[in-house]
Interface confidence: medium
């Protein structure tokens, strides 16, 4: 039996700059029941606070709701482990919520097969920003990628679309069913998960008109 090993803050993420969660990896428990607490202070403040919500984001996590989240303020976050033999603390993590955004995937992914005047067909892919993202006000600047592949293929073909929420894909195989997904990334932050797959079959004989 021994004091607990040093915990490590594994990651912190925000879906929207309005709330965020931090997760930690416990160290060794020293063979004894071990309690974990997350404490934090904000830059320029002397007060130390305890995690406001250990439940919402699951085990070994702390959820900061709107009332506990400020942007452009550095949070100095530490996880403490305590058992009967002693205690240990993680290295402090200095977190700026602005930079840890991992948004929800884009939504309303729609696929349309179109034809140019020269009879060349293409796939028109359109989508909307994630619901929580206030793109119009400039609160978020979002970049997007789409990926697609024939249903049976293993390799995805990825296209970066910049700030565009639509993209035209040419030179697809007629008669082939394609799977398409999209994802987004804020100006500072992480790529979202890929959206749910949408599928479309490229026609063998295209007779529709624009």
């Amino acid at each position: 039996q021994s004091p607990p090993g040093k915990p490590e803050i594994h990651k912190c993420r925000s879906p929207d700059k309005e709330t965020f969660t931090c997760w930690w990896n416990p160290g060794t428990d020293g063979g004894l029941p071990t309690n974990y607490s997350l404490t934090y202070s904000k830059e320029g403040e002397k007060t130390t606070y305890e995690c406001p919500d250990y439940k919402t984001s699951g085990p070994n996590s702390c959820f900061f709701s709107k009332q506990y989240t400020s942007i452009w303020k550095i949070y100095i976050i530490t996880v403490n482990a305590t058992n009967q033999m002693g205690s240990s603390s993680s290295d402090p993590l200095y977190v700026d919520v602005t930079y840890i955004v991992e948004p929800e995937p884009p939504r309303n992914l729609t696929l349309e097969v179109k034809q140019l005047k020269d009879k060349k067909t293409y796939l028109w892919v359109k989508w909307s920003p994630p619901t929580i993202t206030d793109v119009k006000t400039g609160w978020f600047t979002m970049e997007y990628e789409i990926r697609l592949k024939p249903e049976e293929a293993e390799e995805w073909e990825i296209h970066f679309t910049g700030h565009q929420t639509q993209f035209k894909v040419f030179d697809l195989y007629p008669g082939q069913k394609y799977l398409v997904q999209t994802r987004c990334k804020p100006d500072h932050g992480y790529w979202s998960r890929w959206s749910q797959e949408s599928s479309v079959e490229m026609p063998n004989d295209f007779t529709l008109k624009d």
Epitope: H10, K11, C12, E43, G44, W72, I74, D91, L93, Y94, V95, D96, T98, Y99, I100, H188, G189
Partner: antibody
Framework: EVKLVESGGGLVQPGGSLKLSCAAS????????MFWVRQTPEKSLEWVAY????????YYPDTVKGRFTISRDNAKNTLYLQMSRLKSEDTAMYYC???????????????WGQGTSVTVSS | DVLMTQTPLSLPVSLGDQASISCRSS???????????LEWYLQKPGQSPKLLIY???NRFSGVPDRFSGSGSGTDFTLKISRVEAEDLGVYYC?????????FGSGTKLEIK
């Protein structure tokens, strides 16, 4: 414990090349921006380069732009500085440092290595 | 480039005295996001620099509260309320608001 260990320094002739490495441990390397800073024999400090946590964004001052390249291998937890067309004024102690803030933000070199010495002389 | 000018170059003090180091930038170092990325570093003899203060006035973890930073715009000050022997070394200011990031020339704190 955050640890940064530089290597690869030495004596090189003007016009020559050298590649510095910085082995990082004690933290999730891919979560942090990294910097190279140098200190001249006269003890003045100069920021030389930075690289974003994923490696997609780099920046250099004009004094080294086009001659130095910062890169990283997140799988190996290692930062690099490729220096070419070296000049005598590049003679310095080269330090790698880790951004204090998790993921983005700016500045604040919270952790430094012990440095590796580069001498450019014929 | 933003020029960072430190004064004095050398600061002789007696242990227990207050010390004050000034740093002036050639232009405002308020970033477009409203923050001021002004930092102070201490380099003790034979060691690499260590971060003391970030964003003008925030002490890095483990830095004693006798160190304090203040200022805004272009004028910044580092104060040490009661100098101890372990505080001796060269102090550098640094701006991380505008690229290229730049250091001051340093202030050597030494025993009178």
């Amino acid at each position: 414990e955050v640890k940064l260990v530089e290597s690869g320094g030495g004596l090189v002739q003007p016009g020559g090349s050298l590649k510095l490495s910085c082995a990082a441990s004690g933290f999730t390397f891919s979560d942090y921006y990294m910097f190279w800073v140098r200190q001249t024999p006269e003890k003045s400090l100069e920021w030389v380069a930075y690289i974003s946590n994923g490696g997609g964004s780099t920046y250099y001052p004009d004094t080294v732009k086009g001659r130095f390249t910062i890169s990283r291998d997140n799988a190996k937890n290692t930062l690099y500085l490729q220096m070419s067309r070296l000049k005598s004024e590049d003679t310095a102690m080269y330090y790698c440092s880790r951004q204090l803030f998790y993921y983005g933000s700016r500045g604040a070199m919270g952790y430094w290595g012990q440095g590796t010495s580069v001498t450019v002389s014929s | 480039d933003v020029l960072m000018t430190q004064t004095p170059l050398s600061l002789p003090v007696s242990l227990g005295d207050q010390a004050s180091i000034s740093c002036r930038s050639s232009q405002s170092i308020v970033h477009s996001n409203g923050n001021t990325y002004l930092e102070w570093y201490l380099q003790k003899p034979g060691q690499s620099p260590k971060l003391l203060i970030y964003k003008v006035s925030n002490r890095f973890s483990g830095v004693p509260d006798r160190f304090s930073g203040s200022g805004s715009g272009t004028d910044f000050t580092l104060k040490i309320s009661r100098v101890e022997a372990e505080d001796l070394g060269v102090y550098y200011c640094f701006q991380g608001s505008h690229v290229p990031f730049t250091f001051g020339s340093g202030t050597k704190l030494e025993i009178k």
